[in-house]
């Protein structure tokens, strides 16, 4: 499809002149930020951003790539170098330490400097690094964590936990030696390391004693509580604050978010990760957009401002499965949440960042016609005279041989949410990729997000913009609309 | 390898504080640009940038990813949407029209709006769009084109040509009907469409009559001239200017670039594309860095300034071959040329952009240890119990089956310049990829390069910064150091 209006040079010249006009008008917001929001698209490399843009555009009945995402409207962009201290290609634990604490760490460790060693409990003490969320709380702001994964997962844990092993979700996931040496599971750290006002996501089973039935799946033993210490961490958390409320479904979340007596809110909507958006039951589970809105309602009440972490955490999972349909529908939902947050906040007082922790070996190639489905086949056939998809992976479970040859694929197969795009190398799980990811920024001090930076720079921009440690002497005018 | 200094949080905190300090000090250069330089890494998507950074760092005996490329030092970054009017994933012709002329076109067409149709000569007339280089020449600036491909190749041709078929290098590549309808081959357009002061790259055979022996390969008939019209285009070009000089080897280039009587310089160093850097004979052929330096010497003499296009054109070719070694060594050489240009120009009066026309389905994954060779194997084995490389392709000639199975690979194989990384789908040629590419900017008006933009915006930024058509009423103070 060639859109007639795009055949005219005036279309492009006018559009560019408008973009130039906007660029010339762009003025840095030089005040401090009252509020900080970081949107983290887990595994959302640039190829995922572009493919999600096309999908979102096509969902809106456009051709695709011309239609801006919410994040595309952010005025400032930088590239972030994601390597961990010990690996060229990182994981979500080491990267969370970087963008949330401002210090790079080692693969699979969270909230610890690189002096800590994976799985060695005795290297924890003394190597803790403090998250920007923690510093925001100390400065009197309200703070929240929202994710589509378990709230104890690597990315959100970077905001509150310190652990040499990202897999220590509950004490049942830890070796006895680590427990004896005094290391704490992530769920325990969630409720005890710091005061978090809003906690929304999955991860019920790590909060309750082993065998405790799940409220949503009472007859499914695999969803029972897992804790060996017999504790009810939700109960312990509720006891800390008079205005604390725990919810486990969408209806309760909506009620709680509108209740002025609720000061602290924990919503855990699945035993483990939340369901993919395409599998979500909207009568039971909230969307990422709804969780973001609920969090913003509560956090916005604090006159001193807030810090909010929002993760589209299952973009990554879709890619690991070699299922681009899942990754991209998650990415579109993530962008919807960004859009909603933009409507509920002001760029005058809120610094909003959108970024990824790392990328994936996911590519969008061949030469598909404009307007063709993002999940479609490439024009023409491969050398083996079989069809192939425009979306492909470098490695992963999409690698299959059928009778010693690459399998053919039809349009109708390639569109299925279950379809695994093919890969060059067979792995149980498709891997992350090591290329730089984008950081999109809007609001006070967003102009500092520029050029090519270490991923750890992201945390420092947030800390500086809100005059948090170690930048309390930030020398910035107070946020718009404040009087202190 | 875990670098000891990186184990200390102070290392990262200090580094980030310095980066913040630099970001806060960053002041837009609000004057007009006297000079414009666009560095075009053909096929240099973000994954190529990161992998090249690691390779360049390792060449410098560092671990790799921490070591900035020359382009990493540019203060402003944007993302560029590369789709063509008719394709989600574009080619180098349609994209050249976008970033050099400011208007998006159709796949395989150059210097024409999307009203033109591929290969249909009669859709050319009236649909021509004018490059920024052409506008710079009209404004009295000197202009130059430097590439490692043929100078008649798609990317450089975007600066001077208008053609419905990028493959019409000489009249021998055109159907008789197109010649009869008055369409001109690209080599003819190179010498006749406009006055170009410096032309450096490959492409000798398209300039001379069929059967004319090549000076470097006189006994290789496949390198003979190709022109059916019997013309000697070099002779015709030399006749246009008293100070014109033609050179075909490195020694002559060095002499000519230092000769003040030379006002126009054409250097064609190979019959077709120039050799890959790893195959270059430095006694015969100049490097991209040397060609860039020679061009800058000549062009800098003009008190009104210059426009220079420099292409690392064979990054793309390495990827098409599924040979990452070639693509990445070309990218490192490209970065060396950027570095040299930075030493020879001032950011006070020169707007320098670095970008790509499109990406490739090239990924850098697995979880390789820090400091491991960029060409190395992934840690561990694949599901088929064979080794695999960190670098892989989505599609391309790297796909091979050996006895109905994926072949194994050793470290020594994977490090060979000839090695083709494996791919998910077998194609003669690995394809481009459709994700956004980075635009790096430094100099006057570089701050306008921000956010996510259409690729066509790039040309408009250059035109505006230098107050060229259609932005002659740019309302900018004159460039630094000028008196008019």
């Amino acid at each position: 499809i060639i859109p007639v209006e795009e055949e005219n040079p005036d279309f492009w010249n006018r559009q560019a002149a408008e973009a130039l006009g906007a660029a010339k008008k762009l003025q840095p917001i030089q005040t401090a930020a009252k509020n900080l929001i970081i949107f983290l698209g887990d595994g959302m490399g640039v190829s995922t951003v572009t493919a999600a843009r096309i999908l979102k555009g096509q969902k809106e009945e456009k051709l695709g790539p011309e239609t801006p995402l919410a994040m595309d409207h952010f005025p400032y962009v930088a590239l972030s170098k994601t390597y961990s201290v010990d690996k060229h290609v990182p994981d979500s634990a080491a990267t969370a330490t970087a963008y949330l604490c401002g210090v790079k760490g080692n693969f699979q460790t969270i909230g610890l400097s690189a002096a800590a060693r994976y799985n060695q409990c005795n290297t924890t003490r003394g190597n803790e690094v403090v998250s920007v969320m923690n510093r925001a709380k100390k400065a009197g702001k309200s703070v929240g964590v929202v994710t589509t994964t378990r709230v104890q997962h690597a990315s959100p844990a970077g905001a509150y936990a310190h652990t040499v092993n990202r897999n220590w979700y509950s004490d049942a996931n830890m070796p006895g030696s680590a427990r004896r040496e005094g290391c704490k599971d992530i769920a325990t750290q969630l409720i005890s390391n710091m005061d978090i006002d809003v906690i929304l996501g999955g991860g019920r089973k790590y909060m309750f004693r082993m065998g405790a039935p799940d409220p949503e799946y009472p007859h499914d033993y695999s969803q029972d509580g897992t804790r060996m210490d017999g504790k009810n961490l939700v109960q312990e958390w509720l006891a800390k604050h008079q205005g604390a409320r725990y919810v486990w479904n969408r209806t309760e979340l909506m009620q709680a978010s509108l209740d002025p007596s609720v000061t602290h809110l924990m919503g855990l909507f699945e035993p483990g990760d939340m369901k993919y958006e395409i599998h979500r039951d909207p009568t039971l589970d909230p969307s990422l957009m709804e969780m973001t809105e609920a969090a913003l309602r509560l956090l916005s009440r604090n006159p001193r401002g807030f810090f909010l972490f929002v993760e589209g955490g299952r973009i990554d999972h879709g890619h690991h499965e070699s299922r681009a349909y899942r990754a991209l529908t998650e990415a579109v939902m993530f962008d919807d949440a960004i859009e909603r947050a933009g409507q509920l906040t002001s760029e005058e007082d809120t610094l909003t960042l959108v970024t990824a922790d790392h990328s994936h070996v996911f590519s969008f190639g061949a030469y598909p016609l404009r307007g063709s489905s993002i999940f479609g086949l490439a024009p023409g056939k491969a050398q083996d005279r079989k069809a192939y998809t425009a979306l492909l992976y470098g490695n992963g479970p999409g690698y299959v041989l059928k009778d010693g040859a690459r399998p053919d694929v039809t349009e109708s197969e390639s569109g299925s949410p279950e379809y695994r795009q093919q890969a060059a190398v067979p792995l149980d799980e498709e891997t992350h990729a090591g290329e730089d990811v984008a950081v999109f920024a809007r609001g006070p001090q967003a102009h500092l997000v520029h050029g090519v930076q270490e991923q750890s720079f992201v945390a420092h921009v947030m800390a500086f913009a809100a005059c948090l440690e170690p930048y309390t002497a930030c020398d910035l005018a107070p946020p718009a609309g404040t009087t202190d | 390898i875990i670098p000891v200094e990186e184990e200390n949080p102070d290392f990262w905190n200090r580094q980030a504080a310095e980066a913040l300090g630099a970001a806060k000090k960053l002041q837009p250069i609000q004057t007009a640009a006297k000079n414009l330089i666009i560095f075009l890494g053909d096929g240099m998507g973000v994954s190529t940038v990161t992998a090249a950074r690691i390779l360049k760092g390792q060449k410098e005996e560092k671990l790799g990813p921490e070591t900035p490329l020359a382009m990493d030092h540019f203060p402003y970054v944007a993302l560029s949407k590369t789709y063509s009017v008719d394709k989600h994933v574009p080619d180098s012709a349609a994209t050249a029209t976008a970033y050099l002329c400011g208007v998006k076109g159709n796949f395989q067409t150059i210097g024409l709006s999307a009203a033109a149709r591929y290969n249909q000569c009669n859709t050319t007339r009236g649909n021509e769009v004018v490059s920024v280089m052409n506008r710079a020449k009209k404004a009295g600036k000197s202009v130059g084109v430097v590439t490692t491909t043929r100078v008649q190749h798609a990317s450089p041709a975007g600066a001077y040509a208008h053609t419905v078929n990028r493959n019409w290098y000489s009249d021998a590549n055109m159907p008789g009907s197109a010649r009869r309808e008055g369409c001109k081959d690209i080599a003819t357009q190179l010498i006749s469409n406009m006055d170009i002061d410096v032309i450096l790259g490959g492409g000798r055979k398209y300039m001379f009559r069929m059967g004319a022996p090549d000076p470097e390969y006189p006994h290789d008939y496949s390198q003979d001239g190709t022109r059916m019209d019997g013309k000697n285009l070099v002779q015709e070009w030399l006749a246009k200017h008293q100070g014109a000089r033609y050179v075909w080897n490195r020694t002559e280039l060095m002499q000519a670039s230092l000769d003040p009587s030379v006002t126009h310089l054409m250097g064609l160093f190979e019959p077709g594309d120039m050799k890959y850097e790893i195959h270059r004979d430095p006694t015969l052929d100049p490097s991209l860095m040397e060609m860039t330096e020679a061009a800058l010497r000549l062009l800098s003499r003009n008190p009104r300034g210059f426009f220079l296009f420099v292409e690392g054109g064979r990054i793309d070719h390495g990827h098409h071959e599924s040979r990452a070694y070639r693509a990445l060594t070309e990218a490192v050489m490209f970065d060396d040329a950027i570095e040299r240009a930075g030493q020879l120009t001032s950011e006070e009066d020169t707007l320098t952009l670095v970008t790509a026309d499109h990406s490739h389905v090239f990924s850098f994954g697995a979880y390789p240890l820090r400091g491991s060779s960029i060409f190395g194997l992934a840690p561990g084995k694949a599901q088929d119990r064979k080794a695999y490389t960190a670098l892989l392709y989505g599609n391309g000639p790297g796909y091979v089956l050996k006895d109905g199975a994926r072949p194994d690979v050793t470290e020594s194989e994977s490090g060979s310049p000839e090695y083709r990384q494996q791919a998910a789908v077998p194609l003669d040629e690995e394809t481009h990829a459709g994700e956004d590419v980075a635009v790096f900017a430094r100099g006057p008006q570089a701050h306008l390069v921000h956010g996510v933009q259409e690729q066509s915006f790039v040309a408009h930024v250059m035109a505006f910064a230098a107050c060229l058509e259609p932005y002659t009423a740019c309302d900018l103070a004159p460039p630094a150091g000028t008196t008019d």
Epitope: L55, Q58, K59, E60, E61, L63, G64, I278, D281, P282, T283, Y325, T329, G371, S372, S373, I374, F375, G376, E411, S412, S414, G415, S416, P417 | -
Partner: nanobody, 121 residues
Framework: QVHLVESGGGLVQAGGSLRLSCAAS????????MGWFRQAPGKEREFVAA???????EYADSVKGRFTISRDNAKDTVYLQMNSLKPEDTAVYYC???????????????WGQGTQVTVSS
Amino acid sequence: QVHLVESGGGLVQAGGSLRLSCAASRRSFSEYAMGWFRQAPGKEREFVAAIGWSGVIEYADSVKGRFTISRDNAKDTVYLQMNSLKPEDTAVYYCAAGLGIRVVSQTPAYWGQGTQVTVSS
């Protein structure tokens, strides 16, 4: 998941009419573009018509002017009104759902089981 159930197929004389229905079991039916495909014996499945959530519509050239697609979001149902039927319209008709009209017309995510339409001459 989206479950699609077609109905309304049957035997009809050439020149006659049929109305196919497709009921979707899913909350965000209105987010999806809906389409109809058909597969004649021994042939590939081919696109017939699609309708986006915004009401934008596309038809295959072979059915333009004869078939009309419509949707009722309140009932989570999409319809295909088939007039001036020809023997070559004989096929199994499948309902499909996808994220946008371009996706549904090429690579639908969800398919119904199909309903047989036979046009006798």
